[in-house]
Interface confidence: medium
């Protein structure tokens, strides 16, 4: 058991053009309140229960009256947290719907009027006992900033609130076989009451001797991950050893999508594609007009002036779905060639190219020598991510445009002296050496080592290196 806590930080106009009108006016003062609905993200039982994990309603916020001519600011919020208690284990993956409601405080007959200002939804992974997670969601032109966490209620602890803790019986240590309860080091893990061998990470129990599995785990002791990879068919024979899914209905069998929505299976659950005018996890939310702000992620709502006429959301780039609720992962299509990295900027895709490539999709290879000139008789060599020039003697630089000092590399061996020459370099060898680079010692009897000196050159003469 535990509590899911939601802290609303701000609700106001989102960034960008098209700031929404203030929902309140001098003639119609109003105040906000919030509703949160939680569902186990991968759970089949959510089909029967709209908010299977629980729901909560906030207090009403301060009364707000718009200042004439002023843009809609962040609106005053209710005090305190929204708290959704959960009785069973925390599922780890959950779906949320957060609705922002407006309560109009004019002279309505029959009391205040309520209307839905914005609705955001999402799926998240969250371990109980962890820090606050921050989130920003947009609904039409509105932006909601909030934080959430799940915490266990004593004596439960752990990421799923399935382990139990009790105060220490002895001041110094826990009983035999029992560990201290981090982070409550002054408490001890309660004696195991689940079925012997029940996985402490993936199983839990509410009655002594039972072993109930968390989402994604199966087997009598919840030690087998649910997987269809080793089954004969997508829902083949059940086995604690293979870890196949239990035979029976698939996520889309019986179509959990209401109001004519179409169902498609995801790896461990399902997804509904809703007809116009309906949305929600199962297309269960209806009677929505453009005034309700049904288009998420900056989508533009047209039509739908009354609940009987369907609205249409025109989605910005990068989003799809009847309510622009689905982000298109355009980078998953791997549009960048040659190992470029993909950036989805929302309005456009960008490729960050590896060195040696260019173009919108990194499709141009800069490594090519085609059309690339190496000056002064140099030749182009491919490789290494950019063209390279192998320069003729006396030239250097990327394109062989720089005149090189042929003596810079000290080419004359054995103390020979180097002289730059229009056709290259000349080595004046020290006594006892000869050759183009003074590399050959002259034998004491006057004969040189191989190769022999060219005719007409005495050992010790300057050798021209052509």
């Amino acid at each position: 058991a535990g509590v899911f806590e939601l802290q609303i930080h701000s609700f106001g106009p989102g960034p960008g053009p098209g700031a929404p009108r203030s929902p309140c006016s001098a003639r119609l003062p109003c105040r906000l309140f919030f509703r949160v609905c939680l569902k186990p993200g991968l759970s089949e039982e959510a089909a029967e229960s709209p908010c299977a994990l629980g729901a909560a309603l906030s207090a009403r916020g301060p009364v707000y009256t718009e200042q004439p001519g002023a843009p809609a600011p962040d609106l005053p919020l209710p005090d305190g947290l929204l708290q959704v208690p959960f009785r069973d284990a925390w599922p780890g993956t959950f779906s949320f719907i957060i609705e922002t409601w407006r309560e109009e405080l004019g002279d309505q007959i029959g009391g205040p009027a309520w209307s839905l200002l914005a609705r955001v939804a999402g799926r998240r992974r969250l371990a109980a006992g962890g820090p606050w997670a921050r989130d920003i969601q947009r609904a039409g032109a509105w932006e909601l900033r909030f934080s959430y966490r799940a915490r266990c209620e004593p004596p439960a602890v752990g990421t799923a609130c399935t382990r139990l803790c009790r105060p220490r019986s002895a001041p110094s240590r826990c009983g035999p076989g029992l560990r201290p309860c981090a982070p409550l080091e002054d408490e001890c893990e309660a004696p195991l009451v689940c079925r012997a061998g029940c996985s402490p990470e993936h199983g839990f129990c509410e009655q002594p001797g039972e072993c109930r599995c968390l989402e994604g785990w199966t087997g009598p002791l919840c030690t087998v991950p649910v997987s269809t990879s080793s089954c004969l068919s997508p829902r083949g024979p059940s086995s604690a050893t293979t870890g196949c899914l239990v035979p029976g209905p698939g996520p889309c069998d019986g179509n959990p999508c209401a109001n004519g929505g179409s169902c498609s299976e995801t790896p461990r659950s399902f997804e509904c594609t809703c007809p116009r005018g309906f949305y929600g996890l199962r297309c269960e939310v209806s009677g929505v007009t453009c005034a309700d702000g049904p288009c998420f992620n900056g989508g533009l709502c047209v039509g739908g002036a009354d609940p009987d006429s369907a609205y249409i959301c025109h989605c910005p780039p990068g989003f799809q779905g009847s309510n622009c609720e689905k982000r298109v992962d355009r980078c998953s299509l791997q549009p960048c060639r040659n190992g470029g990295l993909c950036l989805d900027l929302g309005h456009a895709l960008r490729c960050r190219c590896r060195a040696g490539f260019a173009g919108p999709r990194c499709e141009h290879d800069l490594d090519d020598c085609a059309g690339r000139a190496c000056a002064n008789g140099g030749t182009c060599v491919e490789g290494g991510g950019a063209h390279r020039c192998s320069c003729a003697l006396g030239f250097g630089g990327r394109d062989c445009r720089e005149r090189a000092d042929p003596c810079a590399a000290r080419p004359c061996a054995h103390g020979g002296r180097c002289y730059a020459h229009f056709s290259g370099l000349v080595c004046a060898c020290a006594p006892g050496y000869m050759g183009a680079r003074c590399e050959f010692p002259v034998h004491p009897d006057g004969a040189s080592a191989l190769p022999a000196a060219p005719p007409g050159l005495r050992p010790g003469d300057p050798q021209r290196y052509l």
């Epitope: 791997q334 190992g339 990295l341 950036l343 960050r352 491919e382 490789g383 991510g385």
Partner: antibody, heavy 119, light 107 residues
């Protein structure tokens, strides 16, 4: 001298997560992308993803369906690969490999980290 | 994804003889193929990239050729230290993919 030193062997239970580290030295960490590759026993090498340490932009192999997360700590010149919802078939040697940033993809490799997934 | 197929799976060659390994891609990868050497207890070593460019520090008895879908790694004169498993890898597009490997031994 360029060196990539990886963290030690890990033994994990199915469903758990593992985080492997790769400490780089001998070059400017943020100037070179980092790839992660794994090799299951008797199997071919399998590319998992690449990250640019300068701003953490990454590209993942869709085969891993969101189970892989690549991160970096530039102050420690260290890259990390986290793999969640482990299965027995994730038992493998996991390598980090530096991207040369020119036409050659992976010019220096880590020594590998053995991850064993067993109940 | 591009599938890389290497042949043969293993190869036994006498010292000083030529060893040839082939790699085929299921679609054209232009020249963007790399070859790696894997030895037990050592880090993997890049030998060739872009089909035929020799990585610096690699002996010139290793050479690569080919483009499009068919590529070859040749060791012109096999040395004892060349005993290893060799992998090809396309670096044309993500996801990068590797061949199944060729084990080279001395006959």
């Amino acid at each position: 001298e360029v060196q990539l030193v990886q963290s030690g062997a890990e033994v994990k239970k199915p469903g758990a997560s593992v985080k492997v580290s790769c400490k780089a030295s001998g070059y400017t960490f943020t100037s070179y992308w980092m790839h992660w590759v794994r090799q299951a026993p008797g199997q071919r090498l399998e590319w998992m993803g690449v990250i640019d340490p300068s701003d953490s932009l990454a590209n993942y192999n869709q085969e891993f369906k969101g189970r892989v997360t690549l991160t970096v700590d530039t102050s420690a010149s260290t890259a990390y690969m986290e793999l969640s919802s482990l299965r027995s078939e994730d038992t493998a040697v996991y390598y980090c490999a530096r991207d040369s940033t020119v036409v050659a993809p992976m010019d220096y490799w880590g020594q590998g980290t053995t991850v064993t997934v067993s109940s | 994804d591009i599938v890389m197929t290497q042949s043969p799976d293993s190869l036994a060659v006498s010292l000083g003889e030529r060893a040839t390994i082939n790699c085929r891609a299921t679609k054209s990868i232009s020249k963007y193929l790399a070859w790696y050497q894997q030895k037990p207890g050592q880090t993997n070593k890049l030998l060739i990239f872009s089909g035929s460019t020799l990585q610096s520090g690699v002996p010139d008895r290793f050479s690569g050729s080919g483009s499009g879908t068919d590529f070859t790694l040749t060791i012109s004169s096999l040395q004892a230290e060349d005993v290893a498993v060799y992998y090809c890898q396309q670096h044309h597009e993500y996801p990068y993919t590797f061949g199944g490997g060729t084990k080279v031994e001395i006959k």
